[in-house]
């Protein structure tokens, strides 16, 4: 009689996580009598997956009825496959004995598990960065298999190139993780911008997963300041206006100083949003010229989002014909937390001088 062959027809089988895997095995002869056992891996550390003769294997069933007369089909079905089931499975014939003696192994079938990546999670910088600076965003996705995966970054639909991506682990594993960092240059127009991390994998049937982050969480757009004087009123009062424009986020404190002394402090709140997501705020101060013998130096001091204060000064001339005169001073951190009245108007898109 010819020698018994243990035939595992498939070299490899690929199964989606959650599905069942069928591992085929037939023997070429009824001789010798003895059971079939299935193992994952080879050598002394191999793991018993199924033993027709004895044991409890709740996830494994024989494809053919083992009591069928002259049965030579010892294929098995493993239910509810997870990435941890990946490996090479061997169908091994034993000769009946006390104990049964291993006789011959099949060539093995490699089971690979297709597992979907988790939804990408995008995280931005811990603290806001000022426009015109570069910040890093990270994207992570886990639990996928096989290892091949594609990750792309987009900002407002345009693919980013300053990207570094790693898939771990480097060697063989039941499942993998990807971590990618994208460096994004912030512009003043980015309050409404979005970065998207897009992950494509064989398990997703061409429908990639996306994770998003809003640049509004990461950006700070510093304000432009302009101080102007309205014409003198009949009652000898001058209306001086401080226009604070194009800033984000809204957290802003404005302090008026008269000749270096705090006159009023205001906090921005409930401002209307510009189309680009920034805010404007206008504050004014009435100065009674007749109460002053000398020129009055007015300073509009703005502290935005916890950053060092920005000042813009203006001198009101106490003379028969007041002349407008604006000058920038170095930033001074002289604002107070004293609250004052808050009047504002939306005066968008004027040309302003910008001072940090």
């Amino acid at each position: 009689e010819e020698e018994l062959q243990v035939i595992q027809p498939e070299k490899s089988v690929s199964v989606a996580a959650g599905d069942s895997a069928t591992l085929n095995c037939t023997v070429s002869s009824l001789i010798p009598v003895g059971p079939i056992q299935w193992f994952r891996g080879a050598g002394p550390g191999r793991e018993l997956i199924y033993n027709l003769k004895e044991g409890h294997f709740p996830r494994v069933t024989a494809v053919s009825d083992p009591t069928k007369r002259n049965n030579m089909d010892f294929s098995i079905r493993i239910s509810n496959i997870t990435p941890a089931d990946a490996g090479t499975y061997y169908c091994v014939k034993f000769r009946k004995g006390s104990p049964d003696v291993e006789l011959k192994s099949g060539a093995g079938t490699e089971l690979s598990v297709r597992a979907k990546p988790s939804a990408p999670v995008v995280s931005g910088p811990a603290v806001r960065a000022t426009a015109e600076h570069t910040v890093s965003f990270t994207c992570e996705s886990h639990g996928f298999s096989p290892r091949d995966i594609t990750l792309k970054w987009f900002k407002n639909g345009n693919e980013l190139s300053d990207v570094q991506t790693n898939v771990d682990p480097a060697g063989k594993s039941v499942s993998y993780s990807i971590r990618s960092t994208a460096r994004v240059l912030l512009t003043r127009r980015d309050v409404h911008s979005q970065v998207i991390c897009e992950v494509a994998h064989v398990t997703l049937q061409g429908d990639p997963l996306r994770g998003t982050a809003n640049l509004s969480e990461a950006i700070r757009v510093p304000p432009f300041l302009e101080v102007t004087q309205q014409s003198m009123r009949a009652d000898n009062q001058v209306n001086v206006t401080c226009q604070v424009t194009k800033f984000y986020p809204q957290r802003l404190q404005l302090t008026w100083l008269e000749n270096g002394n705090v006159s009023r402090t205001e906090m921005a709140s409930a401002l209307p949003e510009n189309k680009d997501g920034t805010y404007n705020w206008t504050s004014w101060l009435l100065v009674n010229v007749s109460a002053h013998r000398d020129d009055v130096k007015l300073t509009c001091q703005v502290e935005h989002d916890g950053q060092p204060a920005v000042n813009k000064s203006f001198s009101v001339k106490v003379s028969a014909h007041p002349k407008e005169q604006g000058s920038n001073t170095a930033a001074e951190n002289t604002g107070t937390n004293e609250r004052g009245s808050s009047d504002y108007k939306d005066d968008d898109d004027k040309h302003h001088h910008h001072h940090h």
Partner: antibody, heavy 119, light 110 residues
Framework: QVQLVQSGAEVKKPGASVKVSCKAS????????INWVRQAPGQGLEWIAM????????HYNQIFKDRATLTTDTSTSTAYMELRSLRSDDTAVYYC????????????WGRGTLVTVSS | DIVLTQSPDSLAVSLGERATINCRAS??????????IFWYQQKPGQPPKLLIY???NLDSGVPDRFSGSGSGTDFTLTISSLQAEDVAVYYC????????FGQGTKLEIK
């Protein structure tokens, strides 16, 4: 290792019934056929029937079809053979045997249960 | 039903000599290249023990002085060199259809 442990000897009157048990261990009970064979004193082996514990499929020797019933209890891995309308010529040792190769052969045997039918 | 007839009914052989027991089926017990004949040994007060399966294959733990041969309807169990512990009754059984046994052959030492 495979073991088949049978119930103890029985003495029955003609016309009565007997139920012999066979408790299996050392293997997965539902994966192998159980055969029942009897041997009258000084006589040869006589095949009675076989049962597949996984689905209770049975095959009977025509001689016993009307009087013998095979059952199993998979929760206890026990096979049973009931023989009704006993006659004196049913006096025999009754064996259970496991078919390890699904060849309708008898690889492992119990030690036998003597059933004596006598008035 | 297939009827198996063993011959002889009893046999006496000297220690160390060859013993041969025959089993003839009333019709062929061969199918798909296999011969569905099995041989058993039964010693007094013990259950039978499988010796040979599918006509010519030694069961595990059976000494290699035992061998089986034959095909179709005629089969033979041979003990090449009889040992004292081989004294027993030998049965053939077929499973081409539902099983039946031969009537048995009693082997003794001459």
């Amino acid at each position: 290792q495979v073991q088949l442990v049978q119930s103890g000897a029985e003495v029955k009157k003609p016309g009565a019934s007997v139920k012999v048990s066979c408790k299996a261990s050392g293997y997965t009970f539902t994966n192998y056929w159980i055969n029942w064979v009897r041997q009258a004193p000084g006589q040869g082996l006589e095949w009675i029937a076989m049962i597949d514990p996984s689905d209770s499929e049975t095959h009977y020797n025509q001689i016993f079809k009307d009087r013998a019933t095979l059952t199993t209890d998979t929760s206890t891995s026990t096979a049973y053979m009931e023989l009704r309308s006993l006659r004196s010529d049913d006096t025999a040792v009754y064996y259970c045997a496991m078919d390890y190769g699904s060849l309708y052969a008898m690889d492992y045997w119990g030690r036998g249960t003597l059933v004596t039918v006598s008035s | 039903d297939i009827v198996l007839t063993q011959s002889p009914d009893s046999l006496a052989v000297s220690l160390g000599e060859r013993a041969t027991i025959n089993c003839r089926a009333s019709k062929s017990v061969s199918s798909s290249g296999y011969n569905y004949i099995f041989w058993y040994q039964q010693k007094p007060g013990q259950p039978p023990k499988l010796l040979i399966y599918l006509a010519s294959n030694l069961d595990s733990g059976v000494p290699d002085r035992f061998s089986g041969s034959g095909s179709g309807t005629d089969f033979t169990l041979t003990i090449s060199s009889l040992q004292a512990e081989d004294v027993a009754v030998y049965y053939c059984q077929h499973s081409r259809e539902l099983p039946t046994f031969g009537q048995g052959t009693k082997l003794e030492i001459k």
